[in-house]
């Protein structure tokens, strides 16, 4: 990536890292308003299976692994990107490496959920306080999960699907920060590991993933009021290990693996019309990216 200053624009969709033949160090940003891509400062270490989030206007890259010709190293790293300076800086590492991690943000704190270290599949969860640059373990999930989708709704943290080391999962659970406890919620209609999970209009969406046999293009959403999962329109492409985010009331899914190819496709879901459309292509196909949107 280039080392010049990032243009000062509105909300951008950032995609960090990923995998194509090896873990990648790219940081790129898509501007939905004009359809352009920006090439930004590379991650200091290549990584795939990471997660991205934004706190206080800064982009954080959490966990993952560096799968390269030289070896394969799971990551406990937390790195912070400042869009104003186009620079990465390291933060305090997590207590354990977490590849194929999920993250969510509540009250400015980053929750790192599950993931794997070698053949260990974590149920542990830890919380990062940016002001103190410290991680602290919180209550573990009821289930070990890697390739877990994480979303925050109404200050509750949801962990959806994933892989427990033996089975791909359709189960989901919810973390209550005030009680420091997890509770199971209604299971999805579909087993999904490596799905894209996000929140839109008071619903949790789970898009794509892998059911243990095939990549999926189906999408379902959870209504917290009725505690039910309902299918919505499927994506055009089957994909697992995809990136997902919400921008101006629409869901964007980025890349992933369809069982044959590493996708460069970016699709956008409009909840008003219940339709998916291809909006752009990434500069190259990849899976296992970390994605987040900058705040205004």
């Amino acid at each position: 990536g280039s080392m010049g200053h990032a243009p000062k624009v509105g909300r951008l969709i950032y995609t960090a890292g990923g995998y194509f033949r090896q873990s990648l160090s790219y940081l790129e940003a898509y501007n939905p308003s004009d359809g352009t891509w920006l090439d930004l400062a590379d991650l200091q270490v290549p990584r795939s299976g990471l997660a991205g989030c934004v706190v206080g206007g800064l982009l954080y890259a959490v966990g993952g692994r560096n799968n390269s010709p030289d070896g394969n190293t799971d990551s406990s790293a937390l790195d912070c990107y400042n869009p104003m300076t186009n620079q990465w800086s390291p933060c305090a590492p997590m207590s354990v490496p977490r590849n194929r991690i999920g993250v969510g943000v509540i009250d400015g704190h980053i929750y790192a959920v599950g993931g794997s270290h070698g053949c260990i599949h974590h149920n542990s969860v830890e919380r990062y306080e940016p002001e103190r640059d410290e991680w602290h373990l919180v209550a573990p999930m009821l289930t070990r999960r890697i390739g877990v989708g994480v979303a925050v709704l109404n200050r509750l943290l949801y962990a959806v699907g994933g892989f427990d080391g033996t089975n791909r999962l359709n189960s989901a659970e919810c973390y209550y920060p005030e009680r420091n406890e997890w509770r199971m919620i209604t299971a999805m209609n579909t087993i999904r590991s490596g799905a894209g999970v996000c929140v839109l209009h008071n619903c949790i969406y789970a898009a794509g993933g892998y059911d243990g046999q095939d990549q999926l293009n189906s999408v379902e959403r959870y209504d917290v009021e009725t505690e039910t999962w309902t299918f919505v329109a499927p994506m055009k492409h089957r994909r697992s290990a995809l990136g997902i985010t919400v921008h101006q009331g629409r869901i964007y899914v980025l890349g992933g693996y369809d069982g044959h190819t590493f996708l460069d496709s970016v699709e956008c879901y409009d909840p008003d019309t219940d339709t998916w459309s291809e909006v752009t292509r990434m500069t190259s196909g990849r899976s296992g990216v970390g994605v987040a949107v900058t705040m205004e």
């Epitope: 995998y19 892989f163 080391g165 590991s193 892998y210 095939d214 697992s240 290990a241 899976s287």
Partner: antibody, heavy 118, light 107 residues
Framework: EVQLVESGGGLVQPGGSLRLSCAAS????????IHWVRQAPGKGLEWVAS????????LYAKSVAGRFTISADTSKNTAYLQMNSLRAEDTAVYYC???????????WGQGTLVTVSS | DIQMTQSPSSLSASVGDRVTITCRAS??????VAWYQQKPGKAPKLLIY???SLYSGVPSRFSGSRSGTDFTLTISSLQPEDFATYYC?????????FGQGTKVEIK
């Protein structure tokens, strides 16, 4: 019945290339990670490469990284090992194996012999 | 890389004997160890996974155990068809590594 059948082995000169195939039946290769393991004549087993069906990520032993490429064609239910820049020390019987979630190879092919010699 | 040191490299035993083969990991591998049996000219066959779980269809005379980083394969009463080479394998961390093998021969 689960079966794995390797093919494509043979005699090749140093620096040459071969492509091994592993045809699966009785299960979908999209449902398990597929691994290649080799065994030099009179020696032990050495893990070579693997492919993850969920993320598409591949892993390689240091001894073959940059020279070998593992891939899978789910429509043909077949995995492949493309071997380039072959060396005498790559001479071995190459096995493909299915590795379910719990990390041990429960089914193996019969093996195919690769001989690298001038 | 994690080394799996297997011992003995060979042993001679009679039918009916109790046979024990050990693998020591150079660092912690949790219980992510498997044992395989291989006969000449044939592919390996899985016997034990996750250190102590007997694979489906494998006779109950085979068992596996773990003590820290030491892993043991035991054949409680050796049968004629058990004369073969046995390998341990760790899948705890990349790269997966095998022991050098133990050849069980007829005394």
């Amino acid at each position: 019945e689960v079966q794995l059948v390797e093919s494509g082995g043979g005699l090749v000169q140093p620096g040459g290339s071969l492509r091994l195939s592993c045809a699966a039946s009785g299960f979908a290769i999209s449902a398990s990670s597929i691994h290649w393991v080799r065994q030099a004549p009179g020696k032990g087993l050495e893990w070579v490469a693997s492919i993850d069906p969920e993320t598409g990520e591949t892993l390689y032993a240091k001894s073959v990284a940059g020279r070998f490429t593992i891939s899978a064609d789910t429509s043909k239910n077949t995995a492949y090992l493309q071997m380039n820049s072959l060396r005498a020390e790559d001479t071995a019987v190459y096995y493909c194996a299915r590795m379910p979630a719990w990390g041990s190879a429960d089914y193996w092919g019969q093996g195919t012999l690769v001989t690298v010699s001038s | 890389d994690i080394q799996m040191t297997q011992s003995p490299s060979s042993l001679s035993a009679s039918v009916g004997d109790r046979v024990t083969i050990t693998c020591r990991a150079s660092q912690s591998v949790s219980s992510a160890v498997a044992w395989y049996q291989q006969k000449p000219g044939k592919a390996p066959k899985l016997l034990i996974y996750s250190a102590s779980s007997l694979y489906s269809g494998v006779p109950s005379r085979f068992s596996g155990s773990r003590s820290g980083t030491d892993f043991t394969l035991t054949i409680s009463s050796l049968q004629p068809e058990d004369f073969a080479t046995y390998y341990c394998q760790q899948s705890y961390s990349f790269p997966s590594t095998f022991g050098q093998g133990t050849k069980v021969e007829i005394k």
